[in-house]
Interface confidence: low
């Protein structure tokens, strides 16, 4: 059985006496201690089961060593059942036990929910000891109570290596509402239907559950906690928030925004962070998400020149890393860049718009008609060729680069000379004779350098030869010609 | 992109205790709304939800499986973990993960499933 | 806890058809069911949440409607691929799935 008692009831005895049909058969008041009357017969039968053998909690001692009579079974005294107060209120309950003093070494824990209760908690144990018996009164103080107090309590006895166990004290903390699920922020399509949940605990129980929103009472009726709420839409934000009632009182829960997702704002701050011939680095600030995530970016690229058509190229992109290069641009060109980024509900405008250049492109193609003679008097080869037809965007003319490779028995060396923009002729000075020399020409510019030209190849003889016909650039398609002398 | 993805032993003998874990990416159980739960189809039957946690460590448990079952996770490993106890021949299925809708907004259904552990329970 | 009833647990349609599954709830769901799809050796895939709104990606084809305890799943013009078991979820309180309906292909 258990009694119950209430804070706002009169106050209740530490020890009240016997409960109907418990087994307690002492009944002096624990408050007069020291004390104690009668002893209890050695078999107890349960209340529960009349004529079954009881052995919960209780210990049934031996004979003395006179042998002359039976101990008591040992078992706490029923106490106060359970506990009802408000949080921060201070609580103090008690155990109480009879031992008969040829027990030595008893001890008295408390332990909450099956865990026993150690360090710094308010428990103290008295022993009122008379001529045949020792009445122990443990008692526990919490001073504060909060919910996390709640719970059931018991006392434990070792004695003679048995266990000796209370029946339980249920201590339950009444307060405000605690939410356990508050409604959370949310960015919502418009006009489309989402929910919102509320939960709170007591106790005391039932909790009820009203919804606010933008300040005005949603439900006119409460809902038992928890609650969810759905919204059929909304066609601007809006903030909700939910009471929670009980009998103690009212807790109101933190105000959500609900949020409408709208398409992105523009992107801002669109920055060159470098250029070549045929590429552009940018990067952006990105614009409001519009309360959706960006989903992806494009990038849009007119030529700004009054020959081009005044097409718009496109490059999509993900919307993170907030950077782009755009690729296949013409070289020495001028280029006007806006970015627009999309959400789930569409594209943003775009950015404003910025101007960039590409750089000087090397050359895209190579020097034309190149020849080689052998000038075997003065040991050279004498280099002709004539200057390629490029492009405005490859820039200016700075020069040439000349590859010479001289092979003979499993030897191959390559040589490179520079030689200015005005310049269509050459002359290098023989490296190896009775070997053949392979002659190769770019043209440069600020941007690079182009294309080689395609080889050329002329057979250098042993000292003492004649002067023969030049070679030089073969036809497309043609085996590249070898003089032979 | 969300996956999800059971292991398991595989076989187990009757009264013995299942462990499973669920391991995920593209998401993150530390992102308030998100919840993952475990749901089972025995050989032949229906879908059976198990377990849900919660974000915050809150833990949902089917009523007539409860005192059976654990769920916990580990928030930084992407892993969410069940545990049963005393499994017999009724406990042979499919187990799934499954994560809760992405918005933080309850009630929530599953929108992404893994591919599912295969348990058989031998007596 | 809430139950759902699922019925048919199965039935046979020809292509280009249509079929209809209906779930009953034990109590009031506020609409907050949703539809999946599951293949042998894949995991359930969703189709429909909140009664009738369709996960992006599914084709129209598939389509839901219902309000209370009352709730019903159409597949309209039946292809091949739609060879597969159907389950109801409610989440109003916790999550319960219905029995399940296997579709077959004439």
């Known amino acids: 059985a258990i009694t119950e008692a209430r804070e706002e009831a009169k106050p209740y005895p530490l020890f009240p006496g016997p409960l109907p049909g418990s087994l307690q058969t002492d009944h002096t008041s624990l408050l007069s201690l020291p004390h104690t009357s009668g002893y209890q017969p050695a078999l107890m039968f349960s209340p529960t089961q009349p004529g079954r053998p009881y052995t919960g909690n209780v210990a049934i001692p031996r004979v003395t060593s006179a042998g002359s009579k039976l101990l008591p079974p040992l078992a706490f005294k029923h106490t106060v059942g359970h506990i009802i107060l408000s949080e921060h209120k201070d609580v103090k309950f008690n155990c109480s036990i009879s031992v008969p003093n040829i027990y030595q070494d008893t001890t008295i824990s408390w332990w909450k929910d099956g865990k026993e209760l150690l360090g710094a908690h308010h428990a103290i144990t008295q022993f009122y000891p008379d001529d045949e018996v020792t009445a122990i009164i443990a008692s526990f103080s919490i001073t504060s109570v909060q919910r996390s107090d709640n719970g059931s309590y018991i006392c434990k006895m070792k004695i003679n290596n048995e266990e000796i166990v209370s029946d339980p004290i249920y201590i339950e903390v009444q307060g405000l509402p605690h939410f356990t699920k508050q409604p959370e922020s949310m960015n919502v399509t418009r006009n489309t239907a989402f929910n919102l949940t509320c939960q709170a605990v007591g106790p005391p129980e039932p909790v009820n559950i009203f919804w606010v929103q933008n300040s005005s009472r949603v439900n006119e009726q409460p809902e038992k906690s928890p609650s969810v709420l759905t919204v059929p839409g909304l066609t601007e934000m809006a903030v909700f928030s939910c009471e929670a009632h009980n009998d103690k009182g009212l807790t109101v829960s933190k105000g959500v925004q609900i949020n409408i997702k709208a398409i992105p704002s523009p992107p801002t701050e669109v920055s060159i962070h470098n250029s070549t011939a045929h590429s552009i680095l940018i990067s952006w600030v990105p614009g409001f998400d519009g309360y959706s995530p960006f989903r992806n970016c494009s990038v849009q690229v007119k030529e700004v020149d009054p020959l081009s058509n005044g097409s718009v190229m496109i490059f999509n992109t993900s919307a993170s890393p907030h950077m782009y290069q755009i690729k296949q641009l013409q070289a020495l060109a001028n280029y006007s860049i806006g970015v627009s980024c999309m959400n789930e509900i569409g594209w943003s405008a775009v950015s404003p718009w910025i101007l960039a250049s590409t750089t000087e492109g090397a050359p895209s193609v190579a020097p034309l008609n190149v020849t080689v003679f052998l000038n075997e008097s003065r040991d050279n080869v004498d280099i002709r060729w004539m200057k390629p037809l490029t492009k405005r965007q490859a820039g200016e003319l700075v020069g040439y680069r000349i590859s010479h490779v001289w092979q003979s028995a499993g030897i191959s060396k390559e040589l490179l000379e520079e030689v200015g923009q005005n310049n269509s002729r050459a002359q290098i000075s023989v490296q190896v004779h009775n070997a053949t020399c392979t002659v190769r020409i770019a043209a440069v510019t600020k941007g690079g350098v182009g294309p080689f030209s395609d080889p050329v190849k002329i057979f250098i003889p042993a000292h003492g030869w004649v002067d023969h016909a030049p070679s030089s650039t073969p036809a497309p398609g043609n085996a590249d010609p070898v003089l032979i002398i | 992109q969300v996956t999800l993805k059971e292991s398991g032993p595989g076989m187990l003998q009757s009264s013995q205790t299942l462990s499973l874990t669920c391991s995920f990416s593209?998401?993150?159980?530390?992102?308030?709304?998100?919840?993952v739960s475990w749901i089972r189809q025995p050989s032949g039957k229906g879908l059976e939800w198990l377990a849900h946690?919660?974000?915050?460590?809150?833990?949902r448990y089917n009523t007539s499986l409860q005192s059976r079952l654990t769920i916990s996770k580990d928030t930084s490993r992407n892993q969410v973990f069940l545990k049963i106890t005393s499994v017999d021949t009724a406990d042979t299925a499919t187990y799934f993960c499954?994560?809760?809708?992405?918005?933080?907004?309850?009630?929530?259904?599953?929108?992404?499933w893994g591919q599912g552990t295969t348990l058989t329970v031998s007596s | 806890d809430i139950q759902m009833t699922q019925s048919p647990s199965s039935l046979s349609a020809s292509l280009g058809g249509k079929v209809t599954i209906t779930c009953k709830a034990s109590?009031?769901?506020?609409?907050?069911i949703a539809w999946y799809q599951h293949k042998p050796g894949k995991g359930p895939r969703l189709l429909i949440h909140?009664?009738?709104t369709l996960q992006p990606g599914i084709p129209s084809r598939f389509s839901g409607s219902g309000s209370g305890r009352d709730y019903s799943f159409s597949i309209s013009n039946l292809e091949p691929e739609d060879l597969a078991t159907y389950y109801c979820?409610?989440?109003?309180?916790?999550?319960?799935f219905g029995g399940g309906t296997k579709l077959e292909i004439k």
């Open positions: 499954g994560r809760l809708g992405a918005y933080s907004a309850f009630p929530y259904y599953f929108d992404y």
């Open positions: 593209g998401f993150s159980l530390s992102t308030s709304g998100m919840g």
């Open positions: 946690i919660y974000w915050d460590d809150d833990k």
């Open positions: 109590q009031d769901i506020h609409k907050h």
């Open positions: 909140y009664t009738s």
């Open positions: 979820l409610q989440y109003d309180n916790l999550w319960t």
